[in-house]
Interface confidence: medium
Amino acid sequence: MAVTACQGLGFVVSLIGIAGIIAATCMDQWSTQDLYNNPVTAVFNYQGLWRSCVRESSGFTECRGYFTLLGLPAMLQAVRALMIVGIVLGAIGLLVSIFALKCIRIGSMEDSAKANMTLTSGIMFIVSGLCAIAGVSVFANMLVTNFWMSTANMYTGMGGMVQTVQTRYTFGAALFVGWVAGGLTLIGGVMMCIACRGLAPEETNYKAVSYHASGHSVAYKPGGFKASTGFGSNTKNKKIYDGGARTEDEVQSYPSKHDYV
């Protein structure tokens, strides 16, 4: 029951996390900037991974996509790549984990197969979460070091027009969404990996005890009952090695050369 709960909760947490990663990737508010602020009008510029927007206190809003790939900084391209990889891995992980859920029965799927699928999806969620956290952190670092405005000229591909005023950008809402979403996906992945351990079928769920004859000179007649292994008979009338009572962890439960002296 605890395993099912852990697996189910891990799936739900990861699902919320991946939805958050998708939302953060699509959001325009990765970085925000107060361009102009006076009692009459305020103009805000905010930028995402795919486009730049301007919003005025009057209600006017305009967004424009980045015109070129070549003119954009490599760091921005790296952040885009990390977020997309995170989404793809997360989506595959979700698909795998649906079939791995203990509460869902698909044909005659073995518990071991479900355990493997749970582990696979868990690892995918962990990597997905790490990708999102890394992507958001790289972008945040760009803002902190003021690398964004010095390198990412939004007018590239438009005749090289430069911005006349350069002011510092601040963290946008998408960064916080990305961090939280990445963390949730990571936690969900860890929960799936923990659930995998409980799903994996154990070799023996209890300690079976084999009882052996205690006497050193006891010989059994042909066809007699062999107490130590429960297989066959002692046809050669040889003494049975006295090992006393031992658990199945200590002795093999099938006849081998070690059973006889």
């Epitope: 005025e56 009057s58 305009e62 005749g159 027009m161 911005q163």
Partner: nanobody, 122 residues
Amino acid sequence: EVQVQESGGGLVQAGGSLRLSCAASGRTFSNYAVGWFRQAPGKEREFVAAITWSGGSTNYADSVKGRFTISRDNAKNTAWLQMNSLKPEDTAVYYCAGGFFATSYSGNYGYWGQGTQVTVSS
């Protein structure tokens, strides 16, 4: 390199109309938003109107809303500012500018014309 040139300014009676033109050279004109700004003697440059690169959205200063209309034709590389019901306080040098956004923020505009004088007499 994009260059912009204003024309159509002049002297007009209060309540009259005037149409300013902004002609741009350069194939990338359609990539830019076009904004109109004005500067009266002894005053700061103020935003008048702007139009997005596609012409799909416009932005006006409260003082000119309902009186001025901005439009553009990307095929002709030209933008216009139709000014109706002119008032003496509209007297200023009118500047056309090309920028990334159709915002009231002058820092957004990288390309500026020399300006054209509009005088409204009472």
